[in-house]
Interface confidence: low
Amino acid sequence: QDPWAAEPRAACGPSSCYALFPRRRTFLEAWRACRELGGDLATPRTPEEAQRVDSLVGAGPASRLLWIGLQRQARQCQLQRPLRGFTWTTGDQDTAFTNWAQPASGGPCPAQRCVALEASGEHRWLEGSCTLAVDGYLCQFGFEGACPALQDEAGQAGPAVYTTPFHLVSTEFEWLPFGSVAAVQCQAGRGASLLCVKQPEGGVGWSRAGPLCLGTGCSPDNGGCEHECVEEVDGHVSCRCTEGFRLAADGRSCEDPCAQAPCEQQCEPGGPQGYSCHCRLGFRPAEDDPHRCVDTDECQIAGVCQQMCVNYVGGFECYCSEGHELEADGISCSPAGAMGAQASQDLGDELLDDGEDEEDEDEAWKAFNGGWTEMPGILWMEPTQPPDFALAYRPSFPEDREPQIPYPEPTWPPPLSAPRVPYHSSVLSVTRPVVVSATHPTLPSAHQPPVIPATHPALSRDHQIPVIAANYPDLPSAYQPGILSVSHSAQPPAHQPPMISTKYPELFPAHQSPMFPDTRVAGTQTTTHLPGIPPNHAPLVTTLGAQLPPQAPDALVLRTQATQLPIIPTAQPSLTTTSRSPVSPAHQISVPAATQPAALPTLLPSQSPTNQTSPISPTHPHSKAPQIPREDGPSPKLALWLPSPAPTAAPTALGEAGLAEHSQRDDRWL
């Protein structure tokens, strides 16, 4: 039987797990699937981590590919750096290992690219179109600690069956992450259920010590207990519940206090009522009802920007509509003349240069930069009317090219369940399906953002869409989410589904990646709330159509918008955006928009940051990284970060000085 038709599998160490999901997904879908389980796409940064991935993936079929957590925005090539301008989905570019299948090319990198790992051979990295569905994906889950696998006992009827917090069920684990459950069946007919929990003395361990399979006591049916049966000294049995559950009135069954809890967002067992409610980052408990969460409203300050205000963690930036440019004060906008038309022409020239159009996602994988023409670049050059974001533009496609709308897999977690402790701070609970279409809307001209009115129509509080302002008084800056939501009361024509044009502002310290909104329809207004943004999540900037399509009442159509809002590095405060941030520049990290589907050209003005990171040489240029043997596979090597014609194509273990080079703000992600 083809192992790729089988269930997901995982390999865990004491502090993290890698899981392989053999499911055909695009990069965005794979990223979201990992996030929904509380993890991220795999980021094998060291030879040791790569070895763990190798052992998990094994010798798969030669043609199979697995997404890992590396992506690069269009025109972000940095060929002299180990990751070639790619960024981990955790938001940084630090690595002590690379495993490129091919040399870097000096092409213009016209499209967004993502990286997949070959399931066969040396598990080399291939880059390609993010919108292509490959054979599977690798997730990585970090945790506070792990319990060792249980030793088999003589009285067991079979091996322990483990269920991880990310819903993998197997008997094959060596380590079980905190929150895992072990089910042991005994020959005497009863069984035991153990939870990997925090121990009072510190660390983690199983909720119950062995031996688990004694021939007397709670047999034959676990003493009638739903969870744990305890044999008391006087011979009678009592029932206990695993952590997070409480004993029901019958003294035998266990109930989840959060199952009936009226928490709007997240619930944690414990507290005087048996549960306590929590709000995701970016939300706070309502003053009149702590079970409800209300959005922390920002950017509503009138006059912050003349036209458009985009919020990001720790600050905001002003932008101007098409045909206007930001004045020196960073707030006002003035007409820009015919710049947009020229920008479109320049873009057309660039895309068509060397015959390297955008990429065709029907093509199979290839490993060099710039491969795969997705959509002919000329499609982007169609003339457009001034954008009115109350109207949903939709390009026409031949019938056989009509974009498919991939829904995220509904299996894990159950769509309406709030994440359980201890994962409430990191699991994305998607309460409505998010629909992503990677097709190309008709674009405004190249260098100008779409027109988004900064002043809102007068609406009732319920219909207003929050725009986040500069600072949360009650949160550290690294956890402040950014949302720009713009209301329009005009309705789109009935036959056109609305779309959300997503853009991703550059983010700072928290290594944040995008999240997906919960959406409620309020009259003719679509109110979008982003779920709270825990670390490793980035905000979306959204412009909203007014009405959801009748065929998908609970779905948002996310449509990527190619127009870029430039983020200017801190070394260029005089350029045309306003950046107000309490965050120290030394800690600013460029983060990719991991959710932005591919094939969208990044339409940036050709500004080069003045603070380009210079290569760093290790202190000991002749020191070697430890050689990790791999079965006829690439061995790690030391590569000095010196200027060279192109980066290494083989697996590379970099000197420690390389790790010190945190990503400066020389990549601008939107």
Epitope: P61, A62, S63, W100, A101, Q102, P103, A104, S105, G106, E118, R124, E359, D360, E363, A364, W365, K366, A367, F368, G370, G371, W372, T373, P634, S635, K637, A639, L640, L642, S644, P645, A646, P647, T648, A649, A650, P651, T652
Partner: antibody, heavy 116, light 107 residues
Framework: EVQLVESGGGLVQPGRSMKLSCAAS????????MAWVRQAPTRGLEWVAS????????YYRDSVKGRFTISRDTAENTLYLQMDSLRSEDTATYYC?????????WGQGVRVTVSS | DIVLTQSPTTLSVTPGETVSLSCRAS??????LHWYQQKTNESPRLLIK???QSMSGIPSRFSASGSGTDFTLNIKNVEFDDVSSYFC?????????FGSGTKLEIK
Amino acid sequence: EVQLVESGGGLVQPGRSMKLSCAASGFTFRNYYMAWVRQAPTRGLEWVASTGSGGDFTYYRDSVKGRFTISRDTAENTLYLQMDSLRSEDTATYYCARAYGYFDYWGQGVRVTVSS
Amino acid sequence: DIVLTQSPTTLSVTPGETVSLSCRASHSVGTNLHWYQQKTNESPRLLIKDASQSMSGIPSRFSASGSGTDFTLNIKNVEFDDVSSYFCQQTQSWPLTFGSGTKLEIK
């Protein structure tokens, strides 16, 4: 077993065209970069061209750019090299190779002689 | 283009000797350097990939080292069967280039 078998060589006059083929078997052709490498007695081994696994992305050495075209038929597991405007300095044995960065498998080679 | 210079051009040894072949790159190629063996009237065969990793099926007498610009192929206990030309090749950047080769002869 990985096998690469070239065909289509022979004698051709300068300025004329010739098309080489390479039949691949024993591996998943569509997943690999492929390349042509040539060897002339006077010039040693010389990389000629590479193609991405989908066939749409190609690389050439400067001296053949605009004259040679590398292509592939994934359905037929075949790699091609269309050589136009041939010159005497193109005379060589042409090898088809699987290009995994390095060239891990080579064909037996096919002789191309450009002479009037 | 990255130029690879191999030395010596020809090497004549007696069986059982250990020999070292050199390959020098005009620019750093990291460890993206590979060694091939080519016997008379045969196709090249990959011996060593990524500067030091032996391919499966290659006798352990063959080893290699180096990174950056200087690389060495070592052959211990040379046998008659080792009579060949040895080429280095870089895959650090386009165009891919080969060295001019070292011809190993047995005295």
